[in-house]
Interface confidence: low
């Protein structure tokens, strides 16, 4: 019978040796077998698993001139870069005619140097701020024992005595680094290196010192920097729109917002060129020589509304015996608020001033007391808001009344003679 | 849930030795610390030494050099804590913590020596 | 060794009041530093570590605070299920030692 097609006769001559190294090396596992006619194909077998992608080579050398004589195979796998995966017992599978023969098994191993499957990373903290740092390392061979270093200093006496995949850090005030070695039978591997950069804590306690129409008077508290002076701190302020929905969390204003810095201490910082009656929202972030703090979260301000900032315009005063005609215009200058009304005053040369209250309409019509004989007659009209008076008009002379000239019809409005209170007259 | 269960009292002679186990569940075994701390009846806490579950290795405190012995089974989620020698004043609750700070405890073994 | 001194050693205390413990190291142990509390009968139970965190499940009114070699272990407003004896305990380094406890109980 052909050699190789008897169960109890192996065709192989030649089966896989063993392979133990570290990560990374390559090596080659080899098989030979004898058989007669035709040389089948020769599989690789891990753990008893075909291998579909193997990169095996296959030889085939035959021992005289016919086709029906005996051949030597030879199939060699390799193995480029040795990593876990690759451990387990090999062997090599042919089928001869109706039989499948199996070589005998060698065996690839991993031993080395521990390998990381994860290191330490670089990452930002705030000073005093607790934070965990990770790192994981294996064999074979197993153990492998855990050291951490910080600045260089191991944080436990021995390998496997101080914490272990997870460093939980109470708190740095210094920029600082951290590594960790892996130990085992072998030797010693060491992680990258992570800086550990300390910013400043987040400022507390943000709030408004004082408002005026278009400014505002901010302070906050200086978080823990560690060892490195607050250099600055940024103060942002954004139009609220009117509840445009910054929430406590949300990371970016709407709009581009009006930054400010301000030189530390004192921490504190008068944001100008407001605008008045208007909500605003405002946040802190201080910085030092290693970078900013976080950004506190958004307070809700509102300057405070202010007084019109002139007086009203185009005002006409027209007398007609005892009844005096006045109407104007809103200022034109910012009102800083809203509008409640305007007050007029007015007086003669030797009368007392009468002040009133118009409210908001834009014009009167006085019926003067006595015989309308005043010589020399004066108006004057300011605009106010809930935060006061703006600016009196300068005194407008009333103007005797001519024929032709409209008169419209108006509500009269009797004041009394002596005014409630005196005003003072621009 | 996160456990640590002890086995039970023991009454030991003078000279003898105690084994005391902690057998851990619902967290991975080999991922964190376990200590070993006693408190005598009336007095403080006083930590025994400590065990790294993943590669076996220990720390004692001097004043138990040579008279305790720490291990583990991996494959049971077990600690062990062995006391040989035994004296009246090794009278105590003896407790398994986990961790390097001791976020679980054991309920805790009593051992009385006693002649 | 690094030895750990806790006083007072007891402290009586009504429900409301604020009670402060304090533990001072002999050296100086950085912020590894735990707090336990224990019942009569039963295990410690963690909570205070690496000096000021609470730890998970603990009430807030319990806080800690100190670096270094001086540490405090504050009750904001004392509640009748924490009459039970303190501990303080360094984890700086081997072997770890434990405060001699405070024992705080109902005035």
């Known amino acids: 019978a052909p050699r190789g097609t008897q169960a109890e006769e192996s065709p192989f001559v030649g089966n896989p040796g063993n392979i133990t190294g570290a990560r990374g090396l390559t090596g080659t596992l080899r098989c030979q077998l004898q058989v007669q006619g035709e040389p089948p194909e020769v599989h690789w077998l891990r753990d008893g698993q075909i291998l579909e992608l193997a990169d095996s080579t296959q030889t085939q050398v035959p021992l005289g001139e016919d086709e029906q004589d005996d051949w030597i195979v030879v199939s060699q796998l390799r193995i480029t870069s040795l990593q876990l995966s690759d451990t387990g017992q090999y062997q090599c599978l042919v089928f001869l005619g109706h039989q499948t023969f199996v070589s005998q098994p060698g065996y690839v191993g991993l031993e080395g140097l521990p390998y990381f499957l994860e290191e330490p990373e670089d990452r930002t903290v705030a000073a005093n701020t607790p934070f965990n740092l990770s790192c994981q390392a294996q064999g074979p061979p197993e153990p492998v024992d855990l050291l951490w270093l910080q600045d260089a200093v191991p944080l436990a006496t021995a390998p496997g005595h101080g914490p272990q995949r997870s460093l939980h850090v109470p708190g740095l005030n210094k920029t600082s680094s951290f590594s960790c070695e892996a130990h085992n039978a072998k030797g010693v591997t060491t992680s990258r290196t992570a800086t550990i950069t300390v910013l400043p804590q987040q400022p507390r306690n943000l709030h408004l010192v004082s408002r005026q129409p278009t400014e505002l008077e901010v302070a906050w508290t200086p978080g823990l920097s560690g060892i490195y002076p607050l250099t600055h701190c940024t103060l942002q302020a954004v139009l609220s729109d009117d509840g445009m929905g910054i929430q406590a969390g949300e990371p970016d204003p709407p709009e581009e917002p009006l930054t400010s810095q301000a030189s530390v201490p004192p921490h504190q910082l008068r944001l100008g060129s407001l605008h008045p009656h208007t909500p605003y929202h405002i946040r802190v972030a201080c910085t030092s020589s290693q970078g900013p703090s976080s950004w506190t979260h958004w307070l809700p301000v509102e300057t405070p509304e202010g007084v019109p900032l002139g007086p009203p315009e185009n005002i006409s005063a027209t007398r007609n015996g005892s009844q005096a005609f006045v109407h104007w215009q809103e200022p034109r200058a910012p009102l800083q608020g809203t509008l409640l009304g305007y007050r007029l005053a007015y007086q003669g040369q030797d009368t007392p001033e009468v002040l009133m209250d118009i409210g908001l309409r834009q014009e009167v019509t006085l019926e003067l007391q006595g015989d309308g004989s005043v010589s020399n007659l004066t108006v004057c009209v300011a605009a106010y808001t809930a935060a006061g008076d703006g600016p009196w008009s300068l005194p407008v002379p009333l103007e005797a009344w001519r024929p032709g000239q409209a008169q419209p019809v108006h509500q009269l409005v009797k004041e009394p003679s002596t005014p409630a209170f005196s005003w003072p007259w621009w | 849930e996160v456990q640590l269960v002890q086995s039970g009292a023991e009454v030991k002679k003078p000279g003898a030795s105690v084994k005391v186990s902690c057998k851990a569940s619902g967290y991975t075994f080999t991922s964190y610390y376990m200590h070993w701390v006693r408190q005598a009846p009336g007095q403080g806490l006083e930590w025994m030494g400590i065990i790294n579950p993943s590669g076996g290795s220990t720390s004692y405190a001097q004043k138990f050099q040579g008279r305790v012995t720490m291990t583990r089974d991996t494959s049971t989620s077990t600690v062990y804590m062995e006391l040989s020698s035994l004296r009246s004043e090794d009278s105590a609750v003896y407790y398994c913590?986990?961790?390097?700070?001791?976020?679980?405890w054991g309920a805790g073994t009593t051992v009385t020596v006693s002649a | 060794n690094i030895q750990m001194t806790q006083s007072p050693s007891s402290v009586s205390a009504s429900v409301g009041d604020r009670v402060t413990i304090t533990c001072r190291a002999s050296?100086?142990?950085?912020?590894?530093l735990a707090w336990y509390q224990q019942k009569p009968g039963k295990a410690p139970k963690l909570l205070i570590y690496?000096?000021?965190s609470l730890q998970s499940g603990v009430p807030s009114r319990f806080s800690g605070s100190g670096s270094g070699t001086d540490f405090t272990l504050t009750i904001s407003s004392l509640q009748p299920e924490d009459f039970a004896t303190y501990y303080c305990q360094q984890a700086n380094s081997f072997p770890f030692t434990f405060g001699g406890g405070t024992k705080v109980e109902i005035k």
């Open positions: 050296q100086g142990i950085s912020s590894w």
């Open positions: 913590a986990r961790d390097w700070y001791f976020d679980v």
């Open positions: 690496a000096a000021s």
